[in-house]
Interface confidence: low
């Protein structure tokens, strides 16, 4: 147990002074039960050269109607109470002008949490006691000084429990109200052990951190049309109720045994999650029972491994994913993670790496849908009462961890002759054991195709002759013509495509005249604009579920419930010949290109979406001037 270990520290951060936008004037006194924290609040943050406007709404679904807290009183007796006055300061929302953005923050003492813009995940926390207007640090997860964390669930524990299907996903937006038959609810009970309590110092600090964590987990699961509702919190402020071992599998077993004994007198819940301050052995930060949701074994253990609560929230989301039948992404052939950020990992990746993930992969969604087909999953269909809502590296676990060159599972299951399953070192004479550029224990020669071109905005990737993994996915240079538009970060955004995405196959872009005005709040009036980069205007198709619309003649715009914000035309959409929407205006394609990048690629490559040379098969980056074989020979590193 290491209750006094220092939190991870930030390596790089930017100091910002958040500015709260004035809310609507209230002319009458608010009833005291509404609390100090408004239903909605907006902040402007100047960070990374941008002014981000965060629109937040209190997460009213955070606490279940019968939410209880259990702790040990001064006299040693166990107390369970239903706290009165369920006001809280935990918010969710989006960033203005960024269609796929998300935010999850607490405003209790300054701003703390995350906001996501495109593929950038920004973390924010106060630097001093100055409250919401004081100095705050904004940084990215990779700038937290922390070690990578892995999940202890291995392939052999998954067994035949997994039978993937397809999943329904939605992009949550303010004002979404989804049909209850679609939404699933996880009623969550969180247990906090004594080591975590000692680390945080008080019941209030524990409560605050747990609510932050669950708020983040809920935000991550909303993309799968799930809500995670906290129905109970148990704080072991005096002593642990069972032995919390550094071995996560032992701790999980103890948790589930304890839970089975407590179930009759504890809150009825769908899932229990332990948050511990104990340092699990090795790189493991979480462990879960697979496909156990809604059963007596529905639970997981999570080490609070990072200064920022987003860290343990990602671990909890991952372990809960196992409870919901999900496997690790690496174990599923052809699994696609749509993440485009540097580390490129989704929530069910076996290890966290240096960046916190923020989405589920295609195969996680398929596993989830498969789990939801089971009669067992019925406990997730009942909505809480919404009216009152206020280990050292282990050889044989299939994860290549510190000190291992490969890991093909336990010796009895290993079918990989390139890997010595007892030592997790490469077999004699083997250069590699895993990876798309590894074939029969040898690294494939430079120039072999390892990732074909998916569409006209993609680029194919080739093995480099040195590494068993395929190079990072890259895309055509932004601005390359594609069907009806211009490539932008691997997509081909057009008005027609956007309208189809929202309104279904029958959706089309509205008449050009519809784009010649911006709608003002409330769908009441409009003002002229000279380009097609304002509000997304469509016609035809089916009105998207849970979205309000503003109709003017044949022009249909999607808006929030209260009519204050409209779905914008996304960045990169074609708005005319050789023109694209960029920063809300129709601009010349040259905005994508700082220089004639392709000229630097020596006719042996093309420029990619990052303005870097993407070399033809067999040629070496960065400028495709030399053959890979020459470069390898010169460096003496040819395998």
């Amino acid at each position: 147990i290491a209750p006094s270990r220092p939190w991870a520290l930030m390596e790089q951060y930017e100091v910002v002074l958040p500015w709260r936008l004035p809310g609507p004037r209230v002319r009458r006194a608010l009833p005291s039960h509404l609390g100090l924290h408004p239903e909605r609040v907006s902040y402007v943050l100047g960070a990374t050269g941008h002014n981000f406007t965060l629109h937040l709404r209190k997460n009213r679904d955070l606490l279940g109607s019968g939410y209880t807290e259990t702790y040990t009183a001064a006299n040693g007796s166990e107390v369970t109470e239903q706290p009165r006055g369920q006001d809280h300061c935990f918010y969710q929302g989006h960033v203005e002008g960024y269609p796929d953005s998300a935010a999850s923050l607490s405003t209790c003492a300054g701003l703390r949490g995350f906001f996501q813009v495109g593929s950038d995940l920004h973390l924010i926390e106060p630097l001093d006691e100055g409250g919401e207007g004081g100095r705050h640090a904004v940084y990215q997860a990779e700038h937290l000084l922390q070690t990578a964390g892995t999940c202890g669930v291995s392939d052999d524990s998954l067994g035949s429990l997994l039978g993937p299907r397809t999943a329904a996903v939605f992009r949550p937006r303010p004002g979404d109200s989804l049909p209850s038959r679609e939404t699933r609810y996880v009623e969550l009970y969180v247990v906090v052990d004594n080591a975590e309590f000692q680390m945080l110092g008080s019941e209030a600090a524990v409560r605050h951190r747990v609510l932050e964590v669950v708020n983040h987990v809920d935000k991550l699961y909303q993309k799968l049309n799930f809500r995670v509702v906290l129905v109970g919190l148990e704080i072991w402020n005096s002593q642990d109720r069972f032995h919390v071992s550094p071995d996560p599998s032992v701790t999980l077993e103890n948790l589930l045994t304890w839970q089975a004994r407590q179930r009759t007198r504890r809150h009825l819940h769908d899932n229990v999650q332990l948050i511990t301050g104990v340092d699990f052995t090795g790189t493991t930060v979480g462990f879960a029972r697979v496909s156990a949701m809604c059963s007596h074994s529905s639970g997981a253990v999570n080490q609070d491994h990072s200064k920022n609560p987003v860290g343990v929230a990602c671990t909890m989301a991952h372990e809960m994913g196992h409870n919901l039948g999900m496997d690790h992404d690496e174990n599923v052939q052809g699994c696609r993670c749509q993440e485009r950020f540097e580390a490129g990992r989704c929530i069910m990746a076996g290890s966290i790496g240096s960046s916190f993930p923020r989405m589920f992969s295609d195969c996680s969604q398929a596993y989830l849908e498969s789990f939801l087909e089971r009669p067992q999953s019925v406990c997730l269909a009942n909505a809480p009462d919404l009216s009152h809502l206020v280990g050292g590296p282990v050889c044989g676990n299939l994860f290549v961890e510190r000190g291992e060159q490969c890991d093909c599972g336990p010796p009895e299951d290993c079918r990989n002759r390139c890997c010595n399953s007892t030592t997790c070192q490469l077999a004699e004479g083997a250069q590699c054991a895993h990876g798309t550029c590894c074939q029969e224990c040898k690294v494939k020669p430079a120039g072999e195709l390892c990732r074909p071109k998916k569409d006209m905005c993609d680029l194919e990737e080739f093995c480099d002759g040195r590494h068993p993994e395929c190079p990072e996915d890259a895309f055509q240079e932004n601005g390359t013509p594609c069907s009806g538009g211009y490539c932008y970060n691997g997509a081909c955004p057009t008005l027609a495509q956007q309208c189809q995405a929202f309104w279904g196959p029958g959706g089309q872009a509205a008449e050009e005249s519809c784009f010649s005005y911006d709608i003002l709040p409330g769908c009441k009036a409009s003002r002229y604009r000279a380009d097609m980069c304002g509000v997304l205007q469509c016609k035809g198709g089916q009105q998207p579920l849970g979205r309000a619309i503003c109709i003017v003649d044949v022009c249909h715009a999607l808006t929030t419930e209260d009519g204050t914000a409209y779905e914008p035309v996304p960045e990169g959409t074609r708005c005319g010949p050789e023109k694209v929407c960029w920063k809300g205006r129709c601009q010349d394609l040259h905005v994508y290109r700082s220089s004639n990048c392709s000229a630097q690629c020596h006719n042996h490559g093309v420029c990619n979406h990052k303005q870097e040379c993407h070399c033809h098969a067999g040629w070496a980056p960065p400028h495709c001037a030399k053959l890979l074989t020459e470069v390898h020979a010169a460096s003496g590193s040819l395998p």
């Epitope: 397809t166 939605f170 989804l178 052809g334 295609d362 279904g504 196959p505 579920l545 849970g546 979205r547």
Partner: nanobody
Framework: EVQLVESGGGLVQPGGSLRLACAAS????????MGWYRQAPGNEREWVAS??????AYADSVKGRFIISRDNAENTIYLQMHSLKPEDTAVYYC?????????????WGQGTQVTVSS
Amino acid sequence: EVQLVESGGGLVQPGGSLRLACAASKSIDNIHAMGWYRQAPGNEREWVASITSSATAYADSVKGRFIISRDNAENTIYLQMHSLKPEDTAVYYCKGQVLVPGGRNDYWGQGTQVTVSS
């Protein structure tokens, strides 16, 4: 609105094969996922197999015997069934899922009868 029409059902002996088809009235490029389900008399409808643009998945009871595939040009998905057993007897339904920002729309076909008997 997407209409789905199943065909290819019939009577077959144990150990035999059948190929079911499900034709969609619209391009299946826009359908996120398509799948086969079956319902035997007196039983609940159960999932058999699914396919998306990037993955296929099967129920344990049919794994290794059934193959799901799709032909985007024909707007059709198929279920190739081998080594059929009497317990595979059921009405087989095709389902399509179209994702919309608020969730999904599910579309079902009318079903085709498969009977495995000697």
